[in-house]
């Protein structure tokens, strides 16, 4: 399928130009999205090209400025969030990035009544997390690792915890392996939905090893970062969750909520916390052997002012094929009883699906069926399902929205997505106001981004919000790769790939092939997504195609394809590599001496190891911040696909799956190994460790390191990067300058 | 030069509600919230609430939530204050006041201009 | 609530001389971050609303005689006439904006001796 016309008019093509690595460093083809900041059915929040916040009432048709840009200027403000009473708003400043999702900034409180900014009792700095409650204006916020609670922004705190303390204990925000591995967000603390009730997380470090790394600075002695970081075996953090009533909060204090027995016997992780209602709360566990999850629904006791988790609502979901969920362990969505949900796992002919759970997991009825998975459950109303799937015309990388109606009987489904741009758009996500009257459908592609606004009811458009008028008026002079999307089967593994195709592409002619790869457990790199990047640049002005294959591993095609890989990470993620390299070379416009693969993270360690399979099919490749061997990485995600290693479990395939493994294998390719020194993620010590078994074996490489750079590698460094990594490959395809 | 006018004295039974009007003129509305403040007979002035007519959101003090309602209409450039349950201790001139709106973090204003004020008298 | 409390209650004062009145705030109106104490001084007239005097403690609104003057921070303020007229007889109020609900002072009437 051909994503993207080719122009074939001479005098046109005359006057258009390719891509150049600047427009890609500079953003030039970057798009927008727009995502309503819902508050309530029929009204949302959008900052305006002038930076005035402005409500918008979809069914009046009015809107007005609540915020003045003046207002977000004079404490240079770069977010803000409104209470949901509509009397304050805060205002974020100074955001200072931590980790993945954390970061610390200073709020200022601005009283939208009276028209000024709170004094007195004012929030002190920086904070590391602060939100509204769902109803009025009461303030809950994380402070040096401890939660406050004010119940109007103007009020004195009330501390909640006293024992937080830096790298030991965390309250309310997660430790390093829970935030990038576990919850994927900064904050763990949980307001019921009324605002009764807050529930929060206490993460327990002391025991946890620490990565220690040197960060350079300007200083004359670097200072070093230690963080707590459970590698692969290691001593894991211990958490508890309780919950605190924030109207009377001194008169209990926190309660803590128990853990299912089943759960707390050995070493264990808590996964996420749902709120069903103000009295009841429902909490996911997953031991630490990741194939046992346990949903477990607790109530509050009036009589006792505790929480009671009885043993008759505890659901167990249990893989015995793999681990327990996708990349992680689904979160249910309740419905209107308050006690039965919807939630997607493993169905018996193992594709991921809707269940419908009442009384028992075992009881569970299917929602939907087939060979293709639900990814996402949006929104349950009383009479409808919205999720998305890859369903439609069975591409594992597409992403349409579905409406199942759930109030009649039976349930009829609808795709409320398919055939609205067909062309232009295959790949949505959508946000929902309350109650799903209205919502926002978000195209990334294969066209140019549209944000448009649908009648909740009806399904009908009533507005575009965002269309890349721009970029698309930029792209007109552009000549832009070819993309296609298409299968391979061998061996009774089907093989999707992605082709990014030079703009006169000639299948009579010989091309030099650049594999991108990434390739991680429950991941997926061939999507039906618009994107103008380094690869586009790669195809468009240096003449190269591009191709990016989704192998065993992968996501969204069935439990089969996704745990082939469990217990064995880099075997099958490089086989299926190699094989689609071989397809392409048999297609015949391939340059045999011409293949190249690159890859970044988990990217990185696959392309590693594809250049060290002894293959002889590449001729040279880039790791950029690659693992190097999985005890080197973090335990929750580690240990998920790859077990404990110890003796009695894996420990085996942890030695045979390093990189270092496999030093010799580098004697006969070109390698570019890049690494940040400050990685808190893909520590450096990986690249360093490669580095050392390449030097002891004495096999040339070459190499980039960048100071003080974590695993994103932003900021000049991303310029510096992609100019290096570009200088390398035409260097090894031999293309001119 | 910048006026609010309010409506006539108010004589009103206990239980009852009354309606206080300020109409503004000579500024622009939007940008100065409106405050409503009490003076009892040989009492302190005493602050009942305000509203920002640029969103509607009203603030009351504590001690009339559930009695006050404070509203706004823009286009008249006029705001509203209406007590309810009346009882004889509401006996009070009310008064409008308008106070500029702090945009900025380092700003901060008094009310500056006053209605004239209006007597409510709650008698049986 | 911050509670604000004037003195004396009531002041006679001659023709001419100067008059102070006192006011105390429960707890500071010190904008720290600002250096600004959110304070202002009303008169009131009998039959009439308060007229603005004085904004943060010690600045004069617009067409107010330079013979009124503020001062003071934190909890501790004063109001001056420097040279009392026969047209400032009148009530005089404090009033704190610092943070809701807004309070005033109980009032100090200033008489001539």
């Known amino acids: 399928i051909v994503l993207r016309p080719s122009r074939v008019h001479n005098s046109e093509e005359n006057t258009m130009r390719a891509l150049t690595l600047k427009d890609i460093l500079n953003g030039t083809f970057s798009y927008k999205t727009f995502f309503p900041n819902w508050i309530s059915g029929q009204e949302y929040l959008h900052q305006s090209a002038d930076n005035n916040i402005v409500l918008y009432n979809i069914e009046t048709g009015q809107s007005y400025t609540i915020l003045s840009n003046r207002t977000m200027k004079s404490v240079n403000a770069s977010n803000y969030g409104l209470s949901p009473d509509r009397q304050f708003v805060y205002l974020e400043s100074d955001y200072s990035k931590l980790w993945r999702y954390s970061y610390t900034a200073t709020y200022y409180i601005y009283d939208l009544s009276n028209g000024e900014f709170v004094r007195g009792n004012e929030l002190p700095r920086p904070i590391q997390y602060l939100c509204w409650s769902p109803v009025g204006s009461k303030l809950a916020y994380v402070y040096q690792n401890n939660i406050y609670l004010k119940q109007r922004p103007g009020d004195p705190p009330f501390q909640i915890t006293f024992n937080g303390r830096e790298n030991k204990i965390f309250n309310g925000i997660p430790d390093w392996v829970y935030e990038e591995e576990m919850l994927a967000t900064k904050y763990a603390l949980w307001w019921s939905p009324n605002g009764k009730f807050l529930a929060y997380a206490e993460f327990n470090d002391t025991d946890i090893p620490v990565i220690a790394y040197s960060y350079y600075g300007d200083e004359q002695y670097p200072r070093t970062i230690n963080i707590p970081y459970p590698k692969a075996g290691a001593k894991n953090p211990v958490v508890r969750i309780f919950i605190i009533d924030t109207t009377y909060p001194a008169y209990v204090g926190p309660q803590e909520v128990p853990v299912p027995a089943m759960i707390a016997s050995s070493d264990y992780y808590f996964s996420w916390l749902t709120w069903v209602t103000d009295e009841r709360v429902c909490l996911q566990w997953l031991k630490r052997v990741q194939n046992v999850s346990v949903l477990s629904i607790c109530d509050f006791r009036e009589d006792w002012q505790t929480w009671d988790c009885p043993k008759t609502q505890e659901h167990i979901e249990e893989s015995r094929t793999g681990w327990a969920g996708g990349f992680f362990v689904s979160t249910p969505v309740f419905s209107y009883d308050a006690i039965s949900y919807y939630k997607i796992f493993s169905d018996k002919d193992g594709y991921k699906h809707i269940h419908y759970i009442k009384d028992t997991v075992e009881n569970a009825i299917q929602i939907t069926s087939g060979k293709w998975e639900a990814i996402n459950i949006f929104r349950v109303t009383q009479d409808s399902l919205f999720y998305s799937s890859n369903e439609f015309e069975e591409y594992p990388g597409r992403r349409n929205i579905y409406r199942i109606s759930i109030g009649s009987y039976p349930p009829s489904k609808k795709c409320v997505t398919c055939h609205l741009r067909k062309e232009r758009c295959q790949y949505y996500t959508a946000s929902f106001s309350d109650y799903a009257k209205y919502y926002a459908l978000v195209c990334y592609g294969p066209g140019i981004p549209i944000s448009t606004l649908h009648d909740g009811r009806t399904d009908q458009e009533i507005k575009i919000l965002e269309e890349n008028k721009e970029l698309e008026n930029a792209l007109k002079n552009i000549q832009l790769p070819k993309e296609e999307i298409k299968k391979l089967e061998v061996d009774e593994i089907t093989l999707w790939y992605k082709m990014i195709l030079p703009p006169q592409f000639d299948r009579s002619k010989k091309y030099p092939l650049l594999i991108q790869v990434y390739g991680g457990p429950c991941s997926q790199s061939v999507r039906s997504v618009f994107a103008v990047n380094w690869i586009s640049y790669l195809a468009s002005k240096e003449g190269m195609v591009i191709a990016l294959v989704d192998g065993r591993g992968t996501a969204f095609q069935g439990d089969k394809l996704l745990y082939a890989v469990y217990r064995k990470l880099g075997v099958y993620e490089v086989e299926d590599q190699i094989t689609a390299v071989r397809k392409f070379i048999e297609m015949g416009f391939i340059d045999e001496k011409r293949i190249a693969i690159w890859g970044w993270s988990y990217g990185g360690y696959v392309s590693s190891l594809a250049l060290a399979s002894g293959t002889g099919l590449f001729k040279c490749g880039i790791a950029v911040a690659p693992v190097s061997s999985w005890e080197y990485y973090a335990s929750v995600y580690t240990e998920r696909f790859m077990g404990l290693p110890t003796k009695d479990d894996n420990l085996e395939h942890y030695k045979n799956s390093t990189v270092m493994a496999r030093a010799e294998y580098f004697r006969n390719v070109d390698y570019l190994l890049i690494h940040g020194t400050a990685d808190d993620n893909v520590h450096f010590q990986n690249s360093a460790q490669i580095a050392k078994a390449l030097v002891n074996a004495q096999v040339d490489f070459q190499a980039m390191w960048y100071s003080d750079q974590n695993h994103g590698l932003s900021g000049l460094s991303t310029n510096h990067l992609y100019t290096h990594m570009t200088h390398f490959l035409k260097q090894c395809f031999s293309l001119s300058d | 030069q910048v006026q609010l006018v309010q409506s006539g004295a108010e004589v009103k039974k206990p239980g009852a509600s009354v309606k206080v009007s300020c109409k503004t003129s000579r500024y622009t509305f939007t940008e100065y919230t409106i405050h409503w403040v009490r003076q009892a007979p040989g009492q302190r002035l005493e602050w009942i609430g305000g509203i920002n007519p640029n969103n509607g959101i009203p603030n009351y003090n504590q001690k009339f939530k559930g009695r006050v309602t404070i509203t706004v209409d823009t286009s008249a450039s006029t705001a509203y204050m209406e007590l309810s349950s009346l009882r004889s201790e509401d006996t009070a001139v009310y008064y409008c006041?308008?106070?500029?709106?702090?945009?900025?973090?380092?700003?901060?204003?008094?009310?500056?201009?006053w209605g004239q004020g209006t007597l409510v008298t709650v008698s049986s | 609530d911050i509670v604000m409390t004037q003195s004396p209650d009531s002041l006679a004062v001659s023709l001419g001389e100067r008059a102070t009145i006192n006011c105390k705030s429960s707890q500071s109106l010190l904008y720290s971050r600002q250096q600004k104490n959110y304070l202002a001084w009303y008169q009131q007239k009998p039959g009439q609303p308060p007229k603005l005097l004085i904004f943060?403690?010690?600045t004069r609104e617009s067409g107010v005689p330079d013979r009124f003057s503020g001062s003071g921070f934190g909890t501790d303020f004063t109001l001056t006439i420097s040279s009392l007229q026969a047209e400032d007889v009148a009530v005089y109020y404090c009033?704190?904006?610092?943070?809701?609900?807004?309070?005033f002072g109980q009032g100090t009437k200033v008489e001539i001796k």
């Open positions: 943060w403690a010690s």
């Open positions: 009033q704190q904006y610092f943070s809701y609900p807004l309070t």
């Open positions: 006041a308008r106070r500029r709106i702090a945009y900025g973090y380092d700003e901060g204003h008094a009310m500056d201009y």
